[in-house]
């Protein structure tokens, strides 16, 4: 069997509210993922998990179930959005998302996904994790790679 | 209703102190910057001071920094300025004002305390 | 600083028609986010200010639908399309793409 490529383009949108009584800000953001089968016979993609973190603490998860199947030799590009959470002993975090004095709140969120394909009863996964920017003050759509933080900006592992 | 109430202004000498004071009501004070702005006797306004919703950031323009304060008590639902240094040139009507995170706008202002610096 | 220019005094309306009031911005007030941080206040005599539009053209919540606004990056102008006796006081237009400045106030006049 050929390889099955999993390529994460970025976010795509950022769509952001606030609950001011619980200091909380609640950022659903849509990813767009490239998978590309380079076999000469359809795949199944079973699930797609995901989840972003954010100063090392997962703020969302989601999970995509019987998503698509992709023909041979063929690509297909898959949105998935994560409802994210910024609350509770990251709330500071609200102070600087409702700041009207600054006019971009980027902050960095790391994006992990793992995407299982199926073919002849074999499941294979294949992961991939990025830094993005997201905007946390208000709602964004991002041209594809726009949010993407550069790798030399990359904290330790 | 959203209501904006300033107290603590007088008449002081350059070179004196003062703190004013603004108590909010109507919304969730904890969640929304604040800042104050002041109307000189001319009628013009000038922005004085913003401080974000848990008080983690000031910002202030060149004219008052270093000399005016801006803090808040989110259990009391409070807003102050501490002036210091005052100059003639601090007279003014000064308002406290609600920042709006969504429309990026002052969207309510207080009814302003009067601030006279005279020797 | 960016400097945000207007004239005192507006030409004198007559009740019913409609008004317009300029201002102009040293700098253009157009982020690069595609957001004009351009605000118009009224403040109406014996009154604080209130607001009418954020960022260039939306009108404020409660704000009659006779105000609009409209404008590039830095020439802006408030249109009061049928004008009420209710609407006469000083507009300031306002820009907080840097540190918030105003302008100088423009006073609606009727005739």
């Known amino acids: 069997p050929r390889s099955i490529d999993v390529k994460y383009i970025g976010v795509k949108s950022a769509y952001v509210s606030y609950d001011v009584q619980k200091r909380t800000i609640y950022l659903n953001i849509t990813n767009t993922l490239n998978i590309t089968n380079n076999n000469y016979y359809s795949v199944e993609v079973e699930n797609i998990t995901a989840q972003v973190q954010f100063a090392k603490t997962v703020i969302g998860k989601a999970r995509l179930n019987n998503i698509t199947h992709i023909g041979p030799l063929d690509m297909k590009q898959i949105d998935y959005t994560v409802p994210t959470v910024i609350a509770e002993e990251m709330s500071y975090m609200y102070d600087f998302c409702t700041l009207i004095s600054i006019k971009v709140h980027n902050i960095v969120l790391m994006m992990q996904v793992t995407v299982t394909t199926t073919y002849f009863g074999h499941s294979e996964q294949i992961s991939q994790e990025r830094y993005q920017y997201v905007d946390c003050g208000r709602n964004t759509t991002y041209q594809l790679g726009q949010s993407e933080y550069l790798n030399v900006l990359q904290p330790q592992q | 209703e959203v209501q904006l109430v300033e107290s603590g202004g007088d008449l002081v000498k350059p070179g004196g102190s003062l703190r004013l004071s603004c108590a909010a009501s109507?919304?969730?004070?904890?969640?929304?910057?604040m800042s104050w702005i002041r109307q000189t006797p001319d009628k013009r306004l000038e922005w004085v001071a913003t401080?974000?919703?848990?008080?983690?950031?000031?910002v202030y323009p060149d004219s008052v920094k270093g000399r005016f304060t801006m803090s808040r008590d989110n259990v009391k639902n409070t807003l102050y300025l501490q002036m210091s240094s005052l100059k003639s040139e601090d007279t003014a009507l000064y308002y406290c004002?609600?920042?709006?995170?969504?429309?990026?706008?002052?969207?309510?202002w207080g009814l302003g305390t009067s601030v006279t610096v005279s020797a | 600083d960016i400097v945000m220019t207007q004239a005192a005094f507006s030409n004198p309306v007559t009740l019913g028609t409609s008004a317009s009031i300029s201002c102009r911005s040293s700098?253009?007030?157009?982020?690069?986010?595609?957001?004009?941080?351009l605000f118009w206040y009224l403040q109406k005599p014996g009154q604080s200010p209130q607001l009418l539009i954020y960022?260039?053209?939306n009108l404020a919540s409660g704000v009659p639908d006779r105000f609009s606004s409209s404008g590039s990056g830095t020439d802006f102008t408030l249109r009061i399309s049928r004008v009420e006796a209710e609407d006469v006081g000083v507009y300031y237009c306002?820009?907080?793409?840097?540190?918030?400045?105003f302008g100088g106030g423009t006073k609606l006049e009727i005739k």
């Open positions: 004002a609600r920042d709006n995170f969504y429309s990026y706008a002052m969207d309510y």
């Open positions: 109507g919304f969730t004070f904890s969640g929304y910057g």
């Open positions: 401080i974000s919703s848990g008080g983690r950031y000031t």
């Open positions: 700098k253009s007030l157009l982020h690069s986010n595609g957001i004009t941080y």
């Open positions: 960022q260039m053209s």
């Open positions: 306002a820009q907080n793409l840097e540190l918030w400045t």
